[in-house]
């Protein structure tokens, strides 16, 4: 049987340098993980030891740290070229800086094919982008050939900024004709590489005839066979085996996120290109794997510009930005308002004439706001200032929740009010009134939310059975600060942009800011 080794990454999100175990900034180098220098060491080790190796990325290299803020994708092309990736699928975040922000730094500079079969360009963009990304690519591996077909979340227009000249088709509908085309070209070993999340990965394995392996991303899914080596809890075995509608066993893999692991899958094919065995596991890229010195030196060279950037002025504030715990954990604070306004602004997507925007609401745990910014320093706001406010390297994500879940979240916000705990919610697009004289779990007496399906936004009472879109920190989406109801009851979760980047972009856009405390959160006693 012919053996293929698939090495894969996904949702790296700008983690070019090594990180701490939780994928935030590396503090103690002896315990740090990931980073492209370490990844290269492991990839080279496997390439030397095994004959037929592919290195694939399933999208979302863009967005996540200051590296992307400064280099805007040039860093992705440079270091992926250095690591000699064989192919990449487009993720939703690759469109964060618009189509131009994808074409110039990445599509034109990448020395490897970038793929998506379900993105179709139209209008003037069609000729401009033609050939810069492909539906599929046939790669020679040894003396065999392997077909790689790409796909991207069809939700991308709601999650990023692809503009109006890209159409995102249904993944399965778009993939099947491309796979059929590969079959007519006598390509009998086909990998679907894409960025639509684990549920869609499994559907592709089940429904798309001719796909032998699915390598996915977007949902940050961790799969592992045996005892996992770090903190991540496996969602299933690696590879996850799906029985296709035509009776084949199709391995599906993903490798968590942030470059912490290198996915490692060995596939055996028979003479007809059928998968006769598959096994492997993600490799934890911990400090036992040395960083490659030449890549590390290159990282250090590129790093210099980042240090300069972090002290440059992004914009000015003419008011004190109150990010103190004494305010943000007890009442509406203007830093919370600023951050929530930035979060909504970052998610402006006019995709439907019926809606002024697809999302109007933001919630933010007060405990996530770690510092104020004093306006008496000439009003200057720098990246460094914002990193003190939002030091955890999180993302601002999009979720869908029922009104009843939101009501539970607001009850949780004040269930032990007065103890300076982090779960007190700052808001945007929401008016909430609490009565602290009532017992915990029954303190929300009014909860109005800003309409989206309206030409003039106004506040309406929350409906318990309605499904709402909300922007919030990934920390809350994952149930942090005791918001288990969000984690357990969310109907959809799409990871968003780096928190500091969202706020810095907003401040740069506004140039001068003056957020106020304006009655988003109120307290009453007795009858309301």
């Amino acid at each position: 049987a012919w053996e293929l080794t698939i090495l894969h990454t996904n949702d790296v999100h700008s983690r070019l340098e090594q990180t701490s175990e939780d994928s935030s900034k590396c503090v103690n180098a002896s315990r740090c993980m990931g980073g492209v220098a370490r990844l290269f060491t492991k990839v080279q080790q496997i390439r030397r030891a095994e004959p037929n190796v592919l290195l694939l990325d399933a999208g979302d290299q863009y967005q996540g740290t200051i590296w992307f803020t400064v280099y805007k994708g040039a860093e992705v092309a440079h270091f992926m070229n250095a690591l000699r990736y064989d192919a990449m699928a487009l993720g939703n975040h690759e469109f964060d800086n618009g189509v131009e922000g994808l074409i110039e730094p990445l599509l034109k500079e990448a020395k490897f094919p970038i793929l998506s079969a379900n993105i179709k360009a139209k209008g003037p963009l069609a000729s401009q982008i033609s050939g810069l990304y492909l539906p599929y690519k046939v790669l020679p591996v040894g003396d065999e050939v392997v077909g790689i077909v790409g796909y991207t979340s069809k939700e991308t227009p709601f999650l990023s900024n692809p503009g109006t000249n890209l159409v995102f088709e249904d993944e399965i509908t778009a993939l099947q004709p491309e796979v059929d085309k590969l079959k007519t070209l006598n390509v009998n070993k086909i990998i679907a590489l894409g960025h639509s999340g684990f549920e869609m990965d499994k559907l592709i394995a089940q429904k798309v005839r001719g796909v032998d392996v699915v390598v996915g991303g977007h949902s940050n899914t961790f799969l592992y066979t045996g005892n996992p080596p770090s903190k991540e809890v496996p969602a299933g075995k690696y590879p996850f085996i799906v029985t296709s509608d035509d009776g084949r066993k199709v391995p599906v893999v993903q490798a968590y996120a942030f470059g912490k692991y290198l996915g490692y899958l060995k596939i055996e094919f028979d003479e007809r290109g059928n998968v006769i065995s598959s096994h492997g596991n993600p490799i934890l890229l911990n400090s036992s794997i040395p960083e490659d010195p030449s890549i590390k030196a290159d990282i250090n060279k590129w790093r210099i510009k980042l240090d300069n950037y972090s002290t440059q002025e992004l914009g000015k504030t003419i008011v004190y930005l109150d990010g103190s715990s004494q305010s943000c954990r007890f009442r509406e604070c203007n830093m919370g308002n600023l951050i929530c306004d930035a979060m909504i602004n970052n998610n402006l997507r006019h995709t439907d004439e019926m809606f002024w925007n697809h999302v109007s609401m933001c919630i933010l745990n007060g405990g996530g706001i770690r510092s104020p910014i004093d306006e008496r320093n000439n009003g200057t706001i720098t990246w460094e200032n914002l990193a003190a406010v939002l030091p955890f390297g999180g993302t601002f994500d999009l979720v869908q929740l029922k009104g009843s879940t939101l009501k539970k979240a607001f009850e949780h916000s004040v269930h032990r009010y007065g103890q300076s705990t982090g779960e007190f919610l700052q808001v945007g697009g929401i008016h909430v009134v609490y009565d602290l004289s009532r017992k915990p779990g029954d303190r929300v007496v009014k909860l109005d939310v800003l309409c989206t399906k309206c030409r003039v936004p106004s506040y309406d009472p929350l409906k318990m059975d309605e499904v709402y879109k909300v922007i919030l920190p990934n920390f809350l989406a994952n149930g942090g600060d005791g918001f288990q109801m969000i984690k357990d009851e969310l109907l959809r979760h799409d990871s968003g942009d780096q928190d500091i980047n969202v706020v810095s972009t907003y401040i740069s856009k506004m140039k001068v800011i003056y957020p106020a405390v304006e009655g988003r959160i109120k307290f009453s006693t007795g009858s309301h």
Epitope: A1, W2, G142, D143, E144, T243, G247, K249, D270, E271, R272, N274, V275, I276, S277
Partner: antibody, heavy 112, light 107 residues
Framework: QVQLQQSGPELVKPGASVKISCKAS????????IHWVKQRPGQGLEWIGW????????KYSEKFKDKATLTADTSSSTAYMQLSSLTSEDSAVYFC?????WGQGTTLTVSS | DIQMTQSPSSLSASLGERVSLTCRAS??????LIWLQQEPAGTFKRLIY???SLDSGVPKRFSGSRSGSDYSLTISSLESEDFVDYYC?????????FGGGTKLEIK
């Protein structure tokens, strides 16, 4: 599509040798093992051995290591099995096989 | 060597009936098992590979499964062309070893 085409039936005398061929098409010959299997009526299927054409490496079942010699010609994508010192016990149908497809079988009759 | 014990060695059944053949492996072979069909003319056709994957062009009435070291081939509704010989084959390690075969006969 993958095909393994074997040579025709053989009638040989005891003590002689015979060389059976198996021509492969529809895939890259050098990348996959070719196995040889013996079938005698009422005796089930017996594995003789394999050859990996890419390297010429071979592996034999203990029972057949002095009986069979496996070779391959990569220029013609053909595998061969030579059977020596034939006796009536060697009368059988011999198959070449990959993991996915089998040859049609070659009938060997050893008779004086 | 890994022994493959196939049962039953022969089976009489009627058209439309559901039947199962079993092979037991003497050592762990994982999912590396093939089911073969041998037609009266002597030609072999692979029905199932990797324990449960259906070969292209093979009718969906054939299916393969595993329970521990027991591997089964099930035919959900017998048709006239199914009354032939069946063999299991393990390819986990050399030497390849086969089950003794099952002759499926029409009742």
């Amino acid at each position: 599509q993958v095909q393994l085409q074997q040579s025709g039936p053989e009638l040989v005398k005891p003590g002689a040798s015979v060389k059976i061929s198996c021509k492969a098409s529809g895939y890259i010959f050098t990348n996959y093992y070719i196995h040889w299997v013996k079938q005698r009526p009422g005796q089930g299927l017996e594995w003789i051995g394999w050859i990996f054409p890419g390297s010429g490496n071979t592996k034999y079942s203990e029972k057949f290591k002095d009986k069979a010699t496996l070779t391959a010609d990569t220029s013609s994508s053909t595998a061969y099995m030579q059977l020596s010192s034939l006796t009536s016990e060697d009368s059988a149908v011999y198959f070449c096989a990959g993991l996915s497809d089998w040859g049609q079988g070659t009938t060997l009759t050893v008779s004086s | 060597d890994i022994q493959m014990t196939q049962s039953p060695s022969s089976l009489s059944a009627s058209l439309g009936e559901r039947v199962s053949l079993t092979c037991r492996a003497s050592q762990d072979i994982g999912d590396r098992l093939i089911w073969l069909q041998q037609e009266p003319a002597g030609t072999f056709k692979r029905l199932i590979y990797a324990t449960s994957s259906l070969d292209s062009g093979v009718p969906k009435r054939f299916s393969g499964s595993r329970s521990g070291s027991d591997y089964s081939l099930t035919i959900s509704s017998l048709e006239s062309e199914d009354f032939v010989d069946y063999y299991c084959l393990q390819y986990a390690s050399s030497p390849w070893t086969f089950g003794g075969g099952t002759k499926l006969e029409i009742k």
